[in-house]
């Protein structure tokens, strides 16, 4: 019986340029974890095995590190990276449990108050 | 440039364990991890694990469990693959291969190690 | 295990003939796959990695695409170095898995 839980950072928002990290922690289950996919709607961002360690798929190598620990730290971020993330957890002998975490990217205020205040 | 090289072929009997080696160079261990993939004659390739010298974790393919055991010297940059008990089914070509830097697929590869398992 | 289904097994072609080799997965694997080529007596090599990236000083006439389960590997216009058998692999979870491969003949 699947008795573990993910507990995710849930809703998070960030400002456009920045970076974000994306965490999620398996508890309430003594299954072994031996794999955690970041995946964000049909594309898959980076695999964390844990004897293996990182893949990250090429078409974020760019803007994706590695860590903390199982998670993923998204960089340089855009307005289109808002949406939904989502963690895999495959774990032995329990299974797969899935984590959700909705990104919001937000325009900087920084930039908008830096481009109406120019230096001539 | 990047190199694989893996020991010579070898004849056992069944129940023994054979031991293939397979020496690296040409690049760090840095964000790859080292495979070992086995093709029986005239058949398709079987993963059979890999192992990451950074961490020094290990993963196998539950067929194998038990009886495959990957190690790596990183000191002379040589990684192992011990099979025991083998079978006659065994027999087969053994490859090492490297993963790409930070990716799970195999861009390098050892030139193969045959094992013939016969009583 | 994941399976990884590869069709057709074996194909006859002529040199500068398109052709495409089909992998299906037994279940999603989004794009974590790769192609690879393999000569009689030699190790594979390898041709796509994450579906759709061409491996560095691999030919432009391999392309590889596909995400989910739906994976093709094309070769547009057949050369002779080209006859060979190639595999798809998934590395979404362990066990890495492969094809049980596709071996291109000369028509």
């Known amino acids: 019986m699947m008795t573990g839980t993910i507990e995710t950072t849930g809703n998070i928002s960030a400002e456009k340029g920045g970076s974000i990290i994306l965490q999620c922690h398996l508890s309430s289950t003594t299954a072994q974890v031996t794999q955690v996919n970041w995946e964000q709607q049909d594309q898959l961002l980076a695999i964390c095995n844990a004897d293996l360690g990182w893949h990250i798929s090429p078409s974020f190598k760019d803007r994706v590190a590695p860590g903390p620990g199982l998670g993923l730290t998204l960089q340089s971020l855009t307005v289109n990276d808002t949406g939904e993330y989502f963690c895999i957890y495959h774990t032995y002998p329990d299974g797969t449990y899935t984590g959700r975490i909705f990104l919001e990217v937000l325009e900087s205020s920084v930039a908008e108050h830096g481009a109406r205040f120019q230096i001539p | 440039q990047v190199q694989l090289v893996q020991s010579g072929a070898e004849v056992k009997k069944p129940g023994a364990s054979v031991k293939v080696s397979c020496k690296a160079s040409?690049?760090?261990?840095?964000?790859?991890?080292i495979h070992w993939v086995r093709q029986a004659p005239g058949q398709g390739l079987e993963w059979i694990g890999g192992f990451n010298p950074n961490s020094g974790g290990s993963s196998y393919n539950q067929k194998f469990k038990g009886r495959a055991t990957l190690t790596v010297d990183k000191s002379i940059s040589t990684a192992y693959m011990e099979l025991s008990r083998l079978r006659s089914d065994d027999t087969a070509v053994y490859y090492c291969?490297?993963?790409?830097?930070?990716?799970?697929?195999?861009?390098?590869w050892g030139q193969g190690t045959t094992v013939t398992v016969s009583s | 295990d994941i399976q990884m289904t590869q069709s057709p097994s074996s194909l006859s072609a002529s040199v500068g003939d398109r052709v495409t080799i089909t992998c299906k997965a037994s279940q999603d694997v989004k794009t974590a796959v790769a192609w690879y080529q393999q000569k009689p007596g030699k190790a594979p090599k390898l041709l796509i990695y994450s579906a759709s990236f061409r491996y560095t000083g691999v030919p432009s006439r391999f392309s590889g695409s596909g995400s989910g389960a739906d994976f093709t590997l094309t070769i547009s216009s057949l050369q002779p170095e080209d006859f060979a058998t190639y595999y798809c692999q998934q590395h979404y979870t362990t066990p890495w898995t492969f094809g049980q491969g596709t071996k291109v003949e000369i028509k």
């Open positions: 291969a490297r993963s790409s830097y930070y990716r799970f697929d195999l861009d390098y």
């Open positions: 040409g690049f760090t261990f840095t964000g790859r991890s």
